[in-house]
């Protein structure tokens, strides 16, 4: 149900840190964790509201 | 949805411990970071501190020693101590989640007023 | 810390004038991941922060299209088009890019003139 995975650079790392699939970035301990730990958006049904309107996510997301 | 509500007393004693409460419905505690912020008479916001899925915690140096985030995940509450209050540490005080893919405060409580006087 | 320098702290307005708010960064907020993690809130009276805009000029779900966001690097603005009554306030900026701790601006109290 979480957004899938992301590839995110840590703040102070020299180059991207890629997560592996249901893993996502976690910006304040800057390394990958399991998606569900972190509240991301979580779909919805077609039609239902959403709670934010979502861009499409970026390659580093 | 998810709400959050802040309960506590609203008159603390200098010196004395403030104690507050967030209870959060619609959302479990174990996922994501839960957080105190604290707004004080003319508008500055004081990001305080939080308490994460995993229960590990960080407290604003500003604040000290004098700070601890605890939680209780079967109430799904999450608690704010704050030691040694004085007349400065009159605010209103809020709980606020996280969102973790952009990193903003998506949910807050309604906050409560918390006055330090003798 | 970061610090969040807010312009002005108060903002007279006549309805339906444009409004714009200033928030300068003591360092960049470009994360190292290419994201620009600033967000601006309005907290309306008696009641809690609401999120406006997140990463820069991105519209929260329910803000109307009046409210825009812009900048880069360590200067970015938030453009009131038309201000309405509801949009009185005090509105502030914050940053995710260098945490913890999150800071926030000073504030910026939009007032009818």
């Known amino acids: 149900m979480r957004r899938g995975p992301r590839s995110l650079r840590g703040r102070d790392a020299p180059a991207p840190t890629a997560c592996v699939p249901a893993e996502c970035f976690d910006l304040l301990v800057r390394h990958c964790v399991a998606c569900g730990l972190l509240r991301t958006p979580r779909p919805k049904p077609a039609g239902a509201s959403s709670p934010a309107p979502r861009t499409a996510l970026q390659p580093q997301e | 949805d998810v709400q959050l509500q802040e309960s506590g007393p609203s008159l603390v004693k200098p010196s004395q411990t403030l104690s507050l409460t967030c209870s959060v419905t619609g959302d479990s505690i174990t996922s994501g970071y839960w957080n105190w912020i604290r707004k004080f008479p003319g508008n500055k916001l004081e990001y305080m501190g939080y308490?994460?899925?995993?229960?590990?915690?960080y407290y604003n140096p500003s604040l000290k020693s004098r700070i601890s985030i605890t939680r209780d995940t079967s109430k799904n509450q999450f608690y704010l101590q704050l030691l040694s209050v004085t007349t400065e540490d009159t605010a209103t005080y809020y709980c606020a989640g996280l969102d973790g893919l952009y990193w903003y405060f998506d949910v807050w409580g309604a906050g409560t007023l918390v006055t330090v006087s003798s | 810390d970061i610090v969040m320098t807010q312009t002005p702290l108060s903002l007279p307005v006549s309805l339906g004038d444009q409004a714009s708010i200033s928030c300068r960064s003591s360092q960049s907020l470009v994360h190292s991941n290419g994201n620009t993690y600033l967000h601006w809130y309005l907290q309306k009276p008696g009641q809690s922060p609401k999120l406006l805009i997140y990463?820069?000029?991105n519209r929260f779900s329910g803000v109307p299209d009046r409210f825009s966001g812009s900048g880069s690097g360590t200067d970015f603005t938030l453009k009131i088009s038309r201000v309405e009554a509801e949009d009185l306030g005090v509105y502030f900026c914050?940053?995710?890019?260098?945490?913890?701790?999150?800071?926030f601006g000073s504030g910026t109290k939009l007032e009818i003139k």
């Open positions: 990463k820069v000029s």
């Open positions: 308490i994460s899925y995993s229960g590990s915690t």
């Open positions: 914050s940053q995710s890019t260098h945490v913890p701790p999150f800071t």
